[in-house]
C-alpha cells in the first residue's frame, strides 16, 4: 500500500526554505479538463516543489501546464542556491500576509478572513470559494496566528514559539496540544469534506484526519473548501506526510501514526505566491 | 455613547430613487463595517449591503446589487444608501447597523427610517 | 442564498413558562456564525445572542441557545414579562446574510 511506505520519512531540523513562486497559476492543482484525450504535459506541484508529469485531457483545465519539463521549470522554479535556508524560527510574517484580499472568481460567496495589512488586523471578507490567493483562512483565530504580531512586540511564529523583539530570546508558547505532535501539513487537511453549494456530482477525494486515510465524497461543482483532490494519490501527496513527532533536538522522525481525536496545532508549509 | 443617527421619512412615487443617511457618532467610523438592513411592515429583515469607509470596500446581497448604491463620507462619519427604482414593495423600514471587522454582531443600530413608496 | 426558517411563527405562553424557539437553515452553517437578535414594537433589532450560544451583554442567564448544522435552539427557562418580542436568527457564514422570518413570542 503506497500509504504506508510514506510512514517513516526522517525530516531533519533543517527544513526546506520557503517556497516563492514566480507565478500564482504555478501554485494550481494539475488540471486534466473535462475532455478525453491523453497529452503528456508537466505542472508544478507545490507539495514536492518541483515539475511533474500528468495527463491532460486537451481542453480547459488552467494554466499550471507546460509542453516540456524545461517550460515549467522556467516559469515556476527559481534558482535556488542564493536562498538561505530555512531554520526552525520564523521570525517574519509569511509573504501571502500581505497579500490584498483576493475573493478569486467563483461565485459560491462565504467568509474568510484575511490579514489587512493597512489595519495591521485580520478581518473578515467574502471569498468566492475558489482560487484566490494564500492570505484567506477559515478562521479568525487561524489567521492571527498566521499573520498578525503577537503582544507586547513579540511575532508569533507557526511552531509555538515567540521571538521577543527586544533581546531576540526565545518564550515558548503555551498551546491546547502536547508539543509532541505537529502538523506540518496545510491546514485545509484538518477541515472536514464540503460539498459545495452547487448541484453537480463529482467524485473526489478529502483526507480524514481522524482516521489518517483520504476518502472518498462526492462535490457539487463549487465552494466547498480546499481539502479537496482529484485523486486519491494527490489527497495523499498533500496531506498524508503532515503529521510528525518532534524527538530531540536531533531532527524530526516520521512515525507510524495512531490518530486519537485530538485538536492539533497547524503549521503551514510555506508556500509563497509572488504575483509578477 | 455610540449613536447611528437617521434621516426623516421619506415618501416617493415608483420609479424615483431615495438616498438616506445615517450619521455615526462615539467611536471611530473607519474601523467598523456599517450595513444596511430593511424590514417590510410585519416581516422579517432582509441584508442590503456593507461598507466599511476606510477602504471603501462593499458587499451587496445580489438582489440589490443594480439598485442600491452605498457610500461614506469620512469627514462627516457619515453612510449613506441610495436605492433606485423604487416600488410598491421597497415601502419599509430602512436602519443602518454597525458591526466590527472580525464578524457580523450587529451591536448598534440606528433608529429606522420609514420610506413609504406610493403613487 | 441560505434560508432561515424559524419555528413557530408565533409561540403563545404564560409568565413563568420555558420557550423554546427553532431556526432550521436550508443548508449547513457554521455555528459561530449563527446569531439572535430581539425586536420590540416600534424599535430596532437588538443584538441578543452570538456565536449560537453567547449572550450579548445584559441579556439574562434564563436565555441560553444551542445547536449546530441545519438546526438552532433559543431557550428561554422561566418567561418573564419583558421577554415577549419577536426573536431573529441571522446567519453569515454564507453571503448574502440572512435572517428568519422572525418568531413572535406573546402573553398567552
Known amino acids: 500500500d503506497s500509504e504506508e511506505d510514506e510512514e517513516h520519512t526522517i525530516i531533519t531540523d533543517t527544513e526546506l526554505p520557503p517556497l516563492k513562486l514566480m507565478h500564482s497559476f504555478c501554485a494550481f492543482k494539475a488540471d486534466d479538463g473535462p475532455c478525453k484525450a491523453i497529452m503528456k504535459r508537466f505542472f508544478f506541484n507545490i507539495f514536492t516543489r518541483q515539475c511533474e508529469e500528468f495527463i491532460y485531457g486537451g481542453c480547459e483545465g488552467n494554466q499550471n501546464r507546460f509542453e516540456s519539463l524545461e517550460e515549467c521549470k522556467k516559469m515556476c522554479t527559481r534558482d535556488n542556491a542564493n536562498r538561505i535556508i530555512k531554520t526552525t524560527l520564523q521570525q517574519e510574517k509569511p509573504d501571502f500576509c500581505f497579500l490584498e484580499e483576493d475573493p478569486g472568481i467563483c461565485r459560491g460567496y462565504i467568509t474568510r478572513y484575511f490579514y489587512n495589512n493597512q489595519t495591521k488586523q485580520c478581518e473578515r471578507f467574502k471569498y468566492g470559494g475558489c482560487l484566490g490567493n494564500m492570505n484567506n483562512f477559515e478562521t479568525l483565530e487561524e489567521c492571527k496566528n498566521i499573520c498578525e504580531d503577537g503582544p507586547n512586540g513579540f511575532q508569533v511564529d507557526n511552531y509555538g514559539t515567540q521571538l521577543n523583539a527586544v533581546n531576540n530570546s526565545l518564550t515558548p508558547q503555551s498551546t491546547k496540544v502536547p508539543s509532541l505532535f505537529e502538523f506540518h501539513g496545510p491546514s485545509w487537511c484538518l477541515t472536514p469534506a464540503d460539498r459545495g453549494l452547487c448541484r453537480a456530482n463529482e467524485n473526489r477525494f478529502y483526507y480524514n484526519s481522524v482516521i489518517g486515510k483520504c476518502r472518498p465524497f462526492k462535490y457539487s461543482g463549487c465552494g466547498g473548501n480546499e481539502n479537496n483532490f482529484t485523486s486519491k494519490q494527490e489527497c495523499l501527496r498533500a496531506c498524508k506526510k503532515g503529521f510528525i513527532q518532534r524527538i530531540s533536538k536531533g531532527g524530526l522522525i516520521k512515525t507510524k501514526r495512531k490518530r486519537k481525536k485530538q485538536r492539533v496545532k497547524i503549521a503551514y508549509e510555506e508556500i509563497f505566491v509572488k504575483n509578477m | 455613547e455610540v449613536q447611528l443617527v437617521q434621516s426623516g421619512a421619506e415618501l416617493k412615487k415608483p420609479g424615483a430613487s431615495v438616498k438616506l443617511s445615517c450619521k455615526a457618532s462615539?467611536?471611530?467610523?473607519?474601523?467598523?463595517?456599517m450595513h444596511w438592513v430593511r424590514q417590510a411592515p410585519g416581516q422579517g429583515l432582509e441584508w442590503i449591503g456593507e461598507i466599511k469607509p476606510d477602504q471603501g470596500r462593499i458587499n451587496y446581497n445580489e438582489k440589490f446589487k443594480t439598485r442600491a448604491t452605498l457610500t461614506a463620507d469620512k469627514s462627516t462619519s457619515t453612510a449613506y444608501m441610495e436605492l433606485s427604482s423604487l416600488r410598491s414593495e421597497d415601502t419599509a423600514v430602512y436602519y443602518c447597523?454597525?458591526?466590527?471587522?472580525?464578524?457580523?454582531?450587529?451591536?448598534?443600530w440606528g433608529q429606522g427610517t420609514t420610506v413609504t413608496v406610493s403613487s | 442564498e441560505i434560508v432561515l426558517t424559524q419555528s413557530p411563527a408565533t409561540l403563545s405562553l404564560s409568565p413563568g413558562e420555558r420557550a423554546t424557539l427553532s431556526c432550521s437553515a436550508s443548508s449547513s452553517v457554521s455555528s459561530s456564525y449563527l446569531y439572535w437578535y430581539q425586536q420590540k414594537p416600534g424599535q430596532a433589532p437588538r443584538l441578543w445572542i452570538s456565536?449560537?450560544?453567547i449572550l450579548a451583554s445584559g441579556v439574562p442567564a434564563r436565555f441560553s441557545g444551542s445547536g449546530s448544522g441545519t438546526k438552532y435552539t433559543l431557550t428561554i427557562s422561566s418567561l418573564e414579562p419583558e421577554d415577549f418580542a419577536v426573536y431573529f436568527c441571522h446567519q453569515w457564514s454564507y453571503y448574502p446574510f440572512t435572517f428568519g422570518q422572525g418568531t413572535k413570542l406573546e402573553i398567552k
Open positions: 447597523a454597525r458591526s466590527s471587522v472580525v464578524d457580523v454582531a450587529m451591536d448598534y
Open positions: 456565536g449560537t450560544s
Open positions: 462615539g467611536y471611530t467610523f473607519t474601523s467598523y463595517w
